[in-house]
């Protein structure tokens, strides 16, 4: 029987993973800093564009892959080029928390794609 096509992560799964890695955490990835991004300019690709530069941090690899799968979709929310704030760097955990807050809002309002 033919194998299934790739199922994309759902917004709910992304939220669960973001909750999982931020729970009871004061820091992530040894306090690594990343560029702040405007999540309204396509949240998946915008967040990935910043987080792609983080290496040697197993805690966020699953999040990176989820974002990549969602960003890779055609058409997909967030396929638009993101706006990076090149003068503002924040800790990885802050970006992840910002993403969690934003994604939760999108999920509540049912605007998944």
């Amino acid at each position: 029987s033919p194998s299934p096509v790739t199922p994309s992560p759902t917004l709910k799964e992304l939220i669960e993973e973001l909750v999982n890695i931020t729970q009871n955490q004061a820091s992530l990835c040894n306090g690594s800093m990343v560029w702040s991004v405007n999540l309204t300019a396509g949240m998946y690709c915008a967040a990935l564009e910043s987080l792609i530069n983080v290496s040697d941090c197993s805690a966020i690899q699953r999040t990176q892959r989820m974002l990549k799968a969602l960003c890779s979709q055609k058409p997909a929310a967030g396929q638009i080029s993101s706006e990076r704030s090149r003068d503002t760097k924040i800790e990885v955990i802050q970006l992840v928390k910002n993403l969690l807050t934003y994604v939760r809002g999108v999920y509540r309002h049912g605007n998944f794609r």
Partner: antibody
Framework: EVQLVQSGAEVKKPGASVKVSCKTS????????MYWVRQAPGAGLEWMGY????????SYNQNFKGRVTLTADKSTSTAYMELSSLRAGDIAVYYC????????????WGQGTLVTVSS | DIVMTQTPLSLSVSPGETASISCKAS??????LAWFRQKPGQSPQALIY???NRYPGVPDRFSGSGSGTDFTLRISRVEAEDTGVYYC?????????FGAGTKVELK
């Protein structure tokens, strides 16, 4: 030391299926996904997909049109790649690999498994 | 899918010289570009990730540069052990895609 040991060479008939195994050691199996890449004789590298043993999540290269199935057995720290409806164009060395330092950059590779398709 | 165009397809270099391999992507990769080397009969070996970061054990003669869609791998002071086929890999989007490869040999 991370080690990936693959099963031996296979000879299959056209239309058949093949299942290649990749036994791991030296790291926590569920912490990192397992990637599969193939290389036809004298050709380049082609990414087939990955499986995350932690939750079974997969991503497949759609060029394989649903012929690839990736699975993982947490109890034995072994990953599997099954390719169905084999044809001559599937003759290749199949590699399993993991990415630890950078997401999706495969730095630890198995030795490869040659799959031959012949009637 | 993102298409990776690698040039040249083959390269003959004298020992001690510098070899340069180019990789062009069909769309912006941000920094998600890696380089591998494969020697005959062996599995690929990861050399560089995120454009310019060397893996442990990779000599500093190997350096990566570039941004956006254009990337370069430079091998300075080429040695006999540097021969093999070099591949670039984009890991910005799925499916991950490799360049066709550049065969590096010694003159």
């Amino acid at each position: 030391e991370v080690q990936l040991v693959q099963s031996g060479a296979e000879v299959k008939k056209p239309g058949a299926s093949v299942k290649v195994s990749c036994k791991t050691s030296g790291y926590t199996f569920i912490d990192y996904p397992m990637y599969w890449v193939r290389q036809a004789p004298g050709a380049g590298l082609e990414w087939m997909g990955y499986i995350d043993p932690y939750n079974g999540a997969t991503s497949y290269n759609q060029n394989f049109k649903g012929r690839v199935t990736l699975t993982a057995d947490k109890s034995t720290s072994t990953a599997y790649m099954e390719l169905s409806s084999l044809r001559a164009g599937d003759i290749a060395v199949y590699y399993c690999a993991t990415a630890v330092v950078a997401t999706d950059v495969m730095e630890n590779w198995g030795q490869g498994t040659l799959v031959t398709v012949s009637s | 899918d993102i298409v990776m165009t690698q040039t040249p397809l083959s390269l003959s270099v004298s020992p001690g010289e510098t070899a340069s391999i180019s990789c062009k992507a069909s769309q912006n990769l941000r920094n998600a570009l890696a380089w591998f080397r494969q020697k005959p009969g062996q599995s690929p070996q990861a050399l560089i990730y995120l454009v310019s970061n060397r893996y442990p054990g990779v000599p500093d003669r190997f350096s990566g540069s570039g941004s956006g869609t254009d990337f370069t791998l430079r091998i300075s002071r080429v040695e006999a052990e540097d021969t093999g086929v070099y591949y670039c890999l984009q890991h910005w989007q799925y499916p991950l895609t490799f360049g066709a490869g550049t065969k590096v040999e010694l003159k």
